[in-house]
């Protein structure tokens, strides 16, 4: 059967067409509900839209959105079980692995900074001509022979980086996990030893560092082949093209905008249904993603969107005291926060977010690269092609991590600094989720049309 | 051959601002990974970091002088500017620009420029 | 103060090995990379070492550097008169998102 995503126009009609009229308006729909929040709320049948309800699972919009057909079911961002974030850099100041975070964060950090890997046997029958096209470690699609092995991009990348930082792994479980296409990132441990197994050389990765070694002090190192299929640039014209006008920023202290409620959350609200209108926007400027089937340009939206929103607002809140920015020019004060019930997450974002990204002073070209890593998340429920948005996901890290050695070589800890910030945008980002789901269920907080999209859509547990 | 060369008034008055020039060669501030940052070194006394401006026009203060401090790049004149309001005595020392290397902090410095604050 | 410790002065004499010790924190040295410098009377400084213990081109090898956990040091071994100068450490503050610098080290040849 097919499910019809609601969205804005001119995604599914400019989807593939210049980007020179970025008017988009529209919603998408939601990630999975947090467990904690149980059964019920926001499925379907239950809690319907105050808009009119179209023929579709997902309660639309009308006119002036289209529908756009969709072989796909109903998608929703699985919810994690068991994180990993054990990884070690080749620094000497990082070279013990992370312990690992709780399950609501498993962001799955790159690289192979995300764990995982099962590996089916090969069906039986002989393999000699069949292996060219395959990945000897994970089945995916083999992009030719690397480090002795035929093997995909994916793995190709994940030993080298292995080999090249030193990094060491562990198993959570018996060190026989599965790595398949669709797991191999679940146990960085075994993907590891499969490509051991399968005839990786250590040898030849650091014989390839060998040949490009010898390269005078004074001379930019070259980003160009991480940055050449992820140009960092069009990431931050990206980041630049949806940003708020600085005009828009006027200084509103709540109350005192007679055209703004008193209440923070109604403000964040419709801040957060604001920016839903850019998010596509922003999406068809990041590379590639444009090119992905359209189902699953939905699916990544839809499970992307609050933590896209998160890290916007935290990010052009770093000159603020205490507070966030909205995109609508307001300010709210964590006074405020506190005073309407959310005082806790509004700490946590300003704690684990905003003054880490102010302490660092991460630039916009970093957070558009961590947008565009929460963005390119292969986990995402119903997706055609993972191992295609992986291997996405995957460019992005390459072209942040060769950035960061460009901009910022003094620190050779920054790339994993700037990792290590999406555990908690995911943590955070669930616990918005939460409160906007209860905010819906009480219905004492008006939820405008975008964002009551995104909270309608129906919901599957992982 | 990269070089580099300060210029400015050599004496100030407290409470007034100083604008030094840093021209440059061998390098342009178009290309991507470079930088210019300005250096400070008191008469007898240790090198403190000012300010830093890279290839895309991201800019980097040291948090004391923060509120004082301003730096502009030209590319086409290959001249970086740094503006030091309120001027005090305390102020006075050798001023420095460098280029910002690839592989970290900096490699090249100009001479240096001695300013002194006094009424 | 400076951010960065390093013994005001030191001494050696031709042909002897000398150490300059530079001590920080997990905030500079220990989560970044060290650099020092050469600051020969009435010059500007000069680029010695970089990344902890990598040398420019045309800085003679008797000129080396080390870390080990927060702090670092400079080595030269083989001294030369021409070796007088001042010394100072670097390394960039995640604090102030910017680089610092060692007190400096006065080198006296003897």
């Known amino acids: 059967m097919d499910t019809k995503h609601f969205l804005p126009l001119d995604f599914s009609t400019q989807v593939n067409s210049s980007l020179t009229s970025p008017t988009g308006r529209g919603s998408m729909a939601a990630p999975s509900l947090h467990p904690s929040l149980g059964p019920g709320i926001g499925s379907p049948g239950q809690l319907h839209s105050p808009i009119s309800t179209l023929s579709s699972p997902i309660n639309g919009m009308g006119p002036p959105f289209s529908v756009i057909s969709s072989p796909m079911g109903p998608h929703s961002m699985s919810v994690p079980t068991t994180p990993t974030l054990g990884f070690s850099t080749g620094s000497p100041q990082l070279s013990s692995p992370m312990n690992p975070v709780s399950s609501s964060e498993d962001i799955k950090p790159p690289l192979g900074l995300n764990g995982v890997l099962k590996v089916p046997a090969h069906p039986s029958g002989n393999m000699a001509s069949f292996t060219k096209h395959i990945c000897a470690i994970c089945g995916d699609r083999s992009s030719g022979k690397h480090y002795g092995v035929y093997s995909c991009e994916g793995c190709k990348g994940f030993f080298k980086r292995t080999v090249r930082k030193d990094l060491t792994y562990t198993c959570r479980d018996n060190k026989d996990c599965l790595i398949d296409k669709r797991q191999r990132n679940r146990c960085q441990y075994c993907r590891y030893q499969k490509c051991l197994a399968m005839g990786m050389k250590r040898e030849a990765v650091q014989e390839e560092r060998q040949r490009g070694k010898d390269r005078n002090e004074n001379e930019v190192e070259s980003t160009s082949s991480a940055n050449e299929d992820m140009p960092v640039e069009r990431i931050l014209e990206a980041e630049l093209a949806v940003e708020p006008k600085t005009e828009t920023y006027v200084e509103a202290n709540m109350g005192l905008n007679p055209s703004s409620p008193n209440d923070p959350v109604t403000n964040i609200c419709q801040a957060a249904d604001k920016q839903l209108f850019t998010l596509v926007e922003w999406a068809k400027r990041i590379p590639h993603f444009s090119e992905l089937p359209l189902d699953d340009q939905v699916i990544l939206l839809r499970a992307g969107w609050n933590e896209l929103l998160i890290a916007s607002f935290s990010h052009r809140s770093i000159a603020v005291k205490d507070g966030i920015l909205l995109a609508t020019g307001l300010h709210v004060h964590r006074n405020s926060a506190h005073s309407a019930g959310v005082g806790a997450i509004f700490d946590r974002v300003l704690t684990e977010l905003v003054s880490k990204m102010r302490d660092m002073q991460m630039d916009k070209t970093e957070l558009g690269c961590l947008r565009a890593i929460v963005l390119f998340n292969p986990d995402s429920k119903g997706l055609s092609n993972p191992a295609e948005v992986e291997a996405l996901r995957e460019k992005v890290y390459a072209s942040l991590e060769a950035y960061c050695k460009h901009k910022y070589p003094e620190q050779p800890g920054r790339f994993a600094k700037l990792l290590l910030r999406l555990p908690a945008l995911r943590s955070i980002g669930l616990k918005c989720l939460e409160h906007l789901f209860f905010f819906k269920l009480i219905g004492d907080t008006p939820i405008d049309t975008f964002l009551m999209e995104m909270l309608e859509a129906p919901h599957q547990m992982t | 051959q990269i070089t580099l060369k300060e210029s400015g008034p050599t004496l100030v008055k407290p409470t007034q601002t100083l604008t030094l020039t840093c021209t440059f060669s061998g390098f342009s501030l178009s290309t991507s990974g470079v930088g210019v940052g300005w250096i400070r070194q008191p008469p007898g006394k240790a090198l403190e970091w000012l300010a830093l401006?890279?290839?895309?026009?991201?800019?980097r203060y040291s948090p004391s002088l923060k509120s004082r401090l301003t730096i502009t790049k030209d590319t086409s004149k290959n001249q970086v500017v740094l503006t030091m309001t309120n001027m005090d005595p305390v102020d006075t020392a050798t001023y420095y620009c460098?280029?910002?290397?690839?592989?970290?902090?900096?490699?090249?410095w100009g001479q240096g420029t001695l300013v002194t604050v006094s009424s | 103060p400076s951010v960065l410790t390093q013994p005001p002065s030191a001494s050696g004499t031709p042909g002897q090995r000398v150490t300059i010790s530079c001590s920080g924190s997990?905030?500079?040295?220990?989560?970044?990379?060290v650099y020092w410098y050469q600051q020969l009377p009435g010059t500007a400084p000069k680029f010695l070492i970089y990344r902890n213990n990598q040398r420019p081109s045309g800085v003679p090898d008797r000129f080396s550097g080390s870390k080990s956990g927060t702090s670092a040091s400079l080595a030269i071994s083989g001294l030369r008169s021409e070796d007088e100068a001042d010394y100072y450490c670097a390394a960039w503050e995640d604090s102030l998102s910017g680089p610092v610098f060692g007190g400096g080290t006065k080198l006296t040849v003897l």
């Open positions: 997990s905030s500079n040295i220990g989560s970044n990379y």
């Open positions: 460098a280029h910002r290397a690839i592989v970290g902090l900096f490699d090249y």
């Open positions: 401006i890279y290839w895309d026009d991201d800019k």
